[in-house]
Amino acid sequence: HTAAQDNCTCPTNKMTVCSPDGPGGRCQCRALGSGMAVDCSTLTSKCLLLKARMSAPKNARTLVRPSEHALVDNDGLYDPDCDPEGRFKARQCNQTSVCWCVNSVGVRRTDKGDLSLRCDELVRTHHILIDLRHRPTAGAFNHSDLDAELRRLFRERYRLHPKFVAAVHYEQPTIQIELRQNTSQKAAGDVDIGDAAYYFERDIKGESLFQGRGGLDLRVRGEPLQVERTLIYYLDEIPPKFSMKRLTA
């Protein structure tokens, strides 16, 4: 009887089923929905988390100007296809054989088509802009304190290497966090910026994915930072391919 058997849960992903049947009675966890093995020492990929979310009961649930190629996730939730490593497959289809191409964070980057649609590669999202508006406070937050607190959050809570937090911008009440991570920069074991952004998004919405941890309590010099709106823009290494019809709509 080991400590692992007493607390066989996944600290970084509550949407798992765990059992102490690994070597020496160690805890082995699998994601809901996909049954895929999950590494509980790091963040779970967004694809597996979305798949788990879709399998769960429904009631369980100086500022930068985004470039013309920035994508916003307007399509909402869907049940994704994940590859054996837990990444999004480049082509996603629904039950009615409508298909589309996605980027590495699972956001649609082409018009929808049929089963003949080809998505040659999974295009990497290398730049994420998280745009937040905080609730009114007595005064503006100190920019350097805010910067330090958000960098600490991404480093400690989401285990994202500090070099991937490119900048924190602030013009009250808007905060922008820029995450950048090129394919060449991401080493084995590095948390993906897309996964970190997704965990952050869920935290901000009060839907923490962490097991047993309290919700996100963001404070800057003791002052609560309460977010009332979040917008996330995704920039891909290759610009998306939408028809002019969509762009002029």
Epitope: A3, A4, N7, C10, G22, P23, R26, C27, Q28, C29, A37, V38, D39, C40, S41, P84, E85
Partner: nanobody, 121 residues
Framework: QVQLQESGGGLVQPGGSLRLSCAAS????????MSWVRQAPGKGLEWVSY????????YYADTVKGRFTISRDNSKNTLYLQMNSLRAEDTAVYRC??????????????WGQGTMVTVSS
């Protein structure tokens, strides 16, 4: 990219023996913990045996303890599973996997396609 290729499976009579091999490439094998897992027809993946990177620490599932032996040759980037006293319930696809062990948790992150072992008279 990570590649794991198993071989050595086949049809064997109850009580017989087989030696499985797994050739690894695309990652530093000598610093990776490894495991054998199996999947019986219609069942989920079951962990069978584990060996650490140096080969100094091994673990076995209760169902195979005393009958199976895991080993590795880091100079050849190869993992082995010696299976003795085989039983009908050992029939499965055997896959080698790159593994990770902490004080409390265990996970596999890459698997080979597998080799079929059938134990039948």
């Amino acid at each position: 990219q990570v590649q794991l290729q198993e071989s050595g499976g086949g049809l064997v009579q109850p009580g017989g023996s087989l030696r499985l091999s797994c050739a690894a490439s695309g990652f530093p094998f000598s610093s990776a913990d490894m495991s054998w897992v199996r999947q019986a027809p219609g069942k989920g993946l079951e962990w069978v045996s584990y060996i650490n990177a140096e080969g100094s620490k091994t673990y076995y599932a209760d169902t195979v303890k005393g009958r199976f032996t895991i080993s590795r040759d880091n100079s050849k980037n190869t993992l082995y599973l010696q299976m003795n006293s085989l039983r009908a319930e050992d029939t499965a696809v055997y896959r080698c996997a790159r593994a990770k062990l902490t004080d409390t948790h265990y996970v596999e992150d890459y698997w080979g396609q597998g080799t079929m072992v059938t134990v039948s008279s």
